[in-house]
Amino acid sequence: FKVATPYSLYVCPEGQNVTLTCRLLGPVDKGHDVTFYKTWYRSSRGEVQTCSERRPIRNLTFQDLHLHHGGHQAANTSHDLAQRHGLESASDHHGNFSITMRNLTLLDSGLYCCLVVEIRHHHSEHRVHGAMELQVQTGKDAPSNCVVYPSSSQESENITA
């Protein structure tokens, strides 16, 4: 399987909400012994590898933000801690999973990574990740809503979170 990031850049005004999205692609084994661990964290663009460093999102670690289920099943963060920090991660039946960040501030700007780990006994641990950039802007140059830039082309889309 692979992870796709529909958008590589999100440009948002301060105070707006944004939903960062990743998509699980390819054949997904739905056997009873296979589960998927999905999570989010902040990182930096490493010289060798993007997403190798794992930093918290609003003081919450990737352990606090994970989703755990089999294949393309729906799930969302179960505890209140994330929501108290204005965060919620969720997953649908189609392989999409996301993190929603509410009331953005300039401190939220940076590189965000989604991670998927396939857990299967007696097999290698299969890990894939996706990366996207969030730019939070303030002042007269800031957009009125979030503007997202697709990963595959330079065309932008306006979205209201």
Epitope: H66, V117, I119, H121
Partner: antibody
């Protein structure tokens, strides 16, 4: 910051049983995947068992399969290891540790000593 | 299971010297290798994850490299608190396995 504290160790005769506990502080224990790891006196580290945050799946090392049972009670912020049919070679310090998929053992308890001897 | 072999078993060095520890896997573990430090009477502490990344709070004098089957942990200039046992550990396959450890002792 979550802290882990093991208990339940002690001296037991071969063939006997013991139940270890790992108490976690912090409200997010129910989100954490956990392992038990042991270390025989003066020896290296050996992974024993792993449990997901929801209690399934569960994995065991071949050396303990069929004798040890890992479980958890998220309401009590606790992890357990039920050890039956104990052998002399099970003598070790037993550690509980956070073990997230795609990550490492990044948070450990202080350990509890289990001695199997007649 | 994947066997990790660490060398040397013991490294006798003085503070300020450079320590180089090796870990070799019986088959490829990709970059899914970690290094831990353990002091007497204490639980291990995570130093390095994914073969080369320092864990939170680990000083820059610790560095690591490698992929596949050969890995190295380097302590550029030994501090008194660095004398301990160091373990490598792989998570590419079940079961998780550890090396037998390298003891870094004061010369």
């Amino acid at each position: 910051q979550v802290q882990l504290v093991e208990s339940g160790g002690g001296l037991v005769k071969p063939g006997g049983s013991l139940r270890l506990s790992c108490a976690a502080s912090g409200e997010t224990f129910s989100e954490y995947y956990m392992s038990w790891i042991r270390q025989a006196p003066g020896k290296g580290l050996e992974w024993v068992s792993w449990i997901s945050n929801s209690g399934e799946p569960i994995y065991y090392a071949d050396s303990v399969k069929g004798r040890f049972t890992i479980s958890r009670d998220n309401a009590k912020n606790s992890l357990y290891l039920q050890m039956n049919s104990l052998r002399a070679e099970d003598t070790a310090v037993y550690y509980c540790a956070r073990d997230e998929p795609g990550w490492e053992f990044d948070l450990w308890g202080r350990g509890t000593l289990v001695t199997v001897s007649s | 299971e994947i066997v990790l072999t660490q060398s040397p078993a013991t490294l006798s060095l003085s503070p300020g010297e450079r320590a180089t520890l090796s870990c070799r896997a019986s088959q490829s573990v990709s970059s899914y290798l970690a290094w831990y430090q353990q002091k007497p009477g204490q639980a291990p502490r995570l130093l390095i994850y994914d073969a080369s990344n320092r864990a939170t709070g680990i000083p820059a004098r610790f560095s690591a490299s490698g992929s596949g089957t050969d890995f190295t942990l380097t302590i550029s200039s030994l501090e008194p608190e660095d004398f301990a046992v160091y373990y490598c550990q792989q998570r590419n396959n079940w079961p998780r396995t550890f090396g037998q450890g390298t003891k870094v002792e004061i010369k």
